[in-house]
């Protein structure tokens, strides 16, 4: 019995993208179950690099080196077949990272987007990478791959993500590779968190003692909702980073977070969003904007408005 039915399935845990020095578990799964399997690395010679070694259930490969990058297949043990082995599995590409300098990853128009919108993730480098790979944290499937376009000493690729839905929110990294070693990837770009807003009802935002305060007076912004949000995110126009706080249940059955801003020096426009622990990159609709004004302060100019940056670990749980 050869062909599709007899084909085992080769998978990698936790991911097919493995850092140099890291470990990866290769599992050869068969619908009838395999106790034993053989692994093959598909170099041009198609010679099993594992010298006929037989593995049980899974094989932990590592610490990996660039030489481990490449395409793997497995064959499962079938005692009653003529050869004793199944047909070869699906090909599985293992990519080893950390072999070149990291590229940069940017989001256009920005990392904070409404549900249904499309975002362009641009991976670029002054290393002339032939290919760029985009990988979402926590996803075991192969990264997306694009050919780099070279202009003015920069190689770049634009990955289009969308229309955005909750499953696409999360932490992205990109990598580059050169032609002769397509699966020996660069170090990862800095992580970029893609946040989707507009999925849940908006919280309300208020200021204590009020939205107009004297210079030097302490200000606290309160974000609250009837929805049982776990985390609130506060952003200010013109500021790169959002702030986060755990929501606290109140006696009036609302869930609230109080953001102490300290002594007031400048005014600004604030918004807050709510999110749940299970989906930290999926946020509510924005609260109505709250303009905080500071009186008695001659210097109330602000930098030009920018989207809140989401490079600061938004998509990791708040412990």
């Amino acid at each position: 019995l050869m062909g599709g039915q007899d084909k085992p399935f080769l998978s990698a845990r936790p991911s097919t993208v493995v850092p140099r020095g890291g470990h990866v578990a290769l599992q050869c799964h068969y619908r009838r179950g395999f106790n034993n399997f053989m692994l093959y690395k598909e170099d041009r010679s198609h010679v099993p690099i594992f010298h006929g070694r037989i593995f049980q259930e899974s094989f932990i490969m590592g610490p990996v080196t660039p030489a481990h990058a490449g395409t793997y297949r497995c064959r499962g043990s079938r005692p009653h077949s003529l050869t004793g082995w199944s047909a070869p599995s699906n090909p599985l590409v293992i990519m080893v990272t950390g072999n070149h300098r990291k590229p940069s990853l940017l989001a256009h128009p920005g990392p904070l987007l409404k549900s249904g919108e499309t975002v362009i993730l641009q991976c670029w480098s002054d290393v002339m990478f032939e290919h760029f790979f985009l990988h979402k944290e926590g996803i075991s499937k192969d990264p997306s791959r694009l050919v780099g376009q070279i202009h003015d000493g920069v190689s770049k690729a634009n990955f289009s993500i969308g229309p955005l839905m909750p499953v696409l929110a999360g932490t992205y990294r990109c990598y580059g590779s050169v032609p002769h070693s397509p699966y020996q990837l660069s170090a990862p770009s800095d992580p970029l968190d893609i946040v989707i807003t507009g999925l849940y009802e908006k919280p309300s935002l208020s200021a204590q003692p009020g939205p107009t305060v004297q210079a030097g007076e302490n200000v606290t912004l309160s974000c609250s909702s009837w929805s049982s949000y776990d985390i609130y995110h506060l952003s200010r126009e013109g500021e790169a980073h959002e702030r986060r706080l755990r929501a606290v249940p109140k006696v009036n059955r609302t869930f609230q977070a109080d953001f102490p801003l300290g002594p007031a020096t400048h005014g600004g426009t604030y918004r807050c969003f709510g999110s749940f622990r299970a989906l930290p990159c999926v946020w509510s609709n924005s609260s109505d904007p709250l303009l905080v004004s500071v009186t008695g302060n001659p210097s109330s100019s602000w930098p030009s408005p920018t989207e809140p940056s989401s490079k600061s670990g938004i998509c990791r749980h708040l412990h």
């Epitope: 070149h100 290393v127 032609p179 002769h180």
Partner: antibody, heavy 115, light 107 residues
């Protein structure tokens, strides 16, 4: 602009060691691998291997395994080719060239091995 | 190893003439092919990469074409300074391999 400047010509006896340098300027040294290419007198070009300037890992073509060694001095943006136990057949011009498609080349270093 | 067969090994051409040099790979190398010009006592000069991309500063009379296994370098109108030895290189797979070279001389 990008430049690769190699050390000067060498006259050596068989059995001796030679070390050729290739100093890079005009770009970030660790961005591009450095290749080494041999041209024997009256012969064509032969790729010897490359060194990953980011990780320091060398890769040698089969004919250049054993007596040949690539190394780096990253702080000085310099790559080196060392040939040990020189033989007459090592008489050649050696070039360094950077990047995956050998975009820029040094001027070459002539190594003459002769008694 | 991938074998690169370059032809012709030498040729004479007149000024203003259109010249084509070919390179054949023993297996598919995608478009990972470069062309170089060598002149005595000078650094090799990279003309083309990725089969058809002209390196900055190289005159537009040079062009490259092909993919897979068959490639060519064309000089649309030969000039005196174009004499030299031309080599192709595959960089799809390690070890990189050069063609045997084509010596181009002026008639």
């Amino acid at each position: 602009q990008i430049q690769l400047v190699q050390s000067g010509p060498e006259l050596k006896n068989p059995g001796e060691t030679v070390k050729i340098s290739c100093k890079a300027s005009g770009y970030i040294f660790t961005n591009y691998g450095m290749n080494w290419v041999k041209q024997a007198p009256g012969k064509g070009l032969k790729w010897m291997g490359w060194i990953n300037t980011y990780t320091g890992e060398p890769t040698y073509a089969d004919d250049f395994k054993g007596r040949f060694a690539f190394s780096l001095e990253t702080s000085a943006s310099t790559a080196y080719l060392q040939i040990n136990n020189l033989k007459n057949e090592d008489t050649a011009t050696y070039f360094c060239a950077h990047g995956p498609w050998l975009a820029y080349w040094g001027q070459g270093t002539l190594v003459t091995v002769s008694t | 190893d991938i074998k690169m067969t370059q032809s012709p090994s030498s040729m004479y051409a007149s000024l203003g003439e259109r010249v084509t040099i070919t390179c054949k790979a023993s297996q598919d190398i995608n478009s990972y092919l470069s062309w170089f010009q060598l002149k005595p006592g000078k650094s090799p000069k990279t003309l083309i990469y990725r089969a058809n991309r002209l390196v900055d500063g190289v005159p537009s009379r040079f062009s490259g074409s092909g993919s897979g296994q068959d490639f060519s370098l064309t000089i649309s109108s030969l000039e005196c300074e174009d004499m030299g030895i031309y080599y192709c290189l595959q960089y799809d797979e390690l070890p990189y391999t050069f063609g045997g070279g084509t010596t181009l001389e002026i008639k």
